[in-house]
Amino acid sequence: EPPTACREKQYLINSQCCSLCQPGQKLVSDCTEFTETECLPCGESEFLDTWNRETHCHQHKYCDPNLGLRVQQKGTSETDTICTCEEGWHCTSEACESCVLHRSCSPGFGVKQIATGVSDTICEPCPVGFFSNVSSAFEKCHPWTSCETKDLVVQQAGTNKTDVVCGPQDRLR
């Protein structure tokens, strides 16, 4: 009686159970009554990540630098290449098919709203009493240092890009 179902890591073909090819190998020919399944290793830059009966291996993913991508983990015959984004860039999807640079706010501006998957960074000018001296996609405007609370006086006024400079009070002799 020919089988109707096969064990794990086998497949049914021509009324008989053949072994699947192991990960990293592709099917060349099905088994017969007299021969085992014939499999061949995947070529360079190819992979198969499951027990399979595929006749072609899959191409490794290409991490396109024009899309801001770089290789996080090189592919093997059993695994695909994993891409990630260049430093300061962010994947546009879970599959990380491309990247975007979340824009930075200039010195003199702070981040009003951090970038999301829907909207880019929103910047706002630092109002009087606040400053930002960096280009950043995360930093808000910082308040000027309060010299008075440190029992100091303002020696140099702050701007939208610089903090105040505090100094000692002149003591009357």
Epitope: T92, S104, C105, S106, F109, S119, D120, C123, N160
Partner: antibody, heavy 119, light 112 residues
């Protein structure tokens, strides 16, 4: 706060030309400045931008032929190899997004200066 | 290049009516979109930024919406003074993208 362009005139094809944009009450070390042009009866065309730290970004067609630079209260647009297709009113405008790179949205515009390229 | 496509090229509506102008980007621009109004012989005027934020002094009859690649400007309770050409502009920057033109082709609004 205001912006005014100057330097537009009638030139022959191939002549280089530099336009100036003079700002008043605008700190060019804080705000970005862009150049936009408009051919007669046509739409707006973005040329490029100079950011607060003097980095420049250009439309793909403008790269190499247009150069934006700035001093304390002026922003220049240097144009080379002019053709009749460059005939347009050229606008200078302040960008207010606060970004450290790339293009910006524009809130204060000059009245424009007309450049006519004709033989 | 990111390409901005604006429709329609022209639209006519009566005083008190509503017009809708669409702007489509060739890739997601993450709500980095502005709208401008331009009248003959004048420079453009900023109406809207970040897709839906009204610029200072712009009446609330102007409404912006959209995300990703699709954006809309709606003008309701049309007034004669709204007769003008309207432009969208993308200011999105990914660090590598370029623009042939950051502006859409424009939409002429005629008020009857």
């Amino acid at each position: 706060q205001s912006v005014e362009e100057s330097g537009g005139r009638l030139v022959t094809p191939g002549t280089p030309l530099t336009l100036a944009c003079t700002v008043s009450g605008i700190d060019l070390s804080t705000w970005t400045m862009s150049w936009v042009r408009q051919a007669p009866g046509k739409g707006l065309e973005w040329i490029g931008i100079i950011n607060s730290d003097s980095n420049t970004y250009y439309a793909s067609w403008a790269k190499g032929r247009f150069t934006i630079s700035k001093a304390s209260t002026t922003v220049d647009l240097k144009m080379t190899s002019l053709t009749t297709e460059d005939t347009a009113t050229y606008f200078c405008a302040r960008g207010v997004g606060g970004y450290s790179s790339g293009p910006d949205y524009l809130d204060i515009w000059g009245p424009g200066t007309l450049v006519t390229v004709s033989s | 290049d990111i390409v901005m496509t604006q429709t329609p090229a022209s639209v006519e509506a009566a005083v008190g009516g509503t017009v809708t102008i669409k702007c489509q980007a060739s890739q997601s621009i993450y709500r980095s979109l502005a709208w401008y109004q331009q009248k003959p012989g004048q420079p453009p005027k900023l109406l809207m930024y970040h897709a839906s934020d009204l610029a200072s002094g712009v009446p609330s009859r102007f409404k912006g919406s959209g995300s990703g690649t699709e954006y809309t400007l709606t003008i309701s309770d049309l007034e004669c003074a709204d007769a003008a050409t309207y432009y969208c502009q993308s200011y999105y920057y990914s660090g590598i993208n370029t623009y042939g033109n950051a502006f859409g082709g424009g939409t002429e609004v005629v008020v009857k």
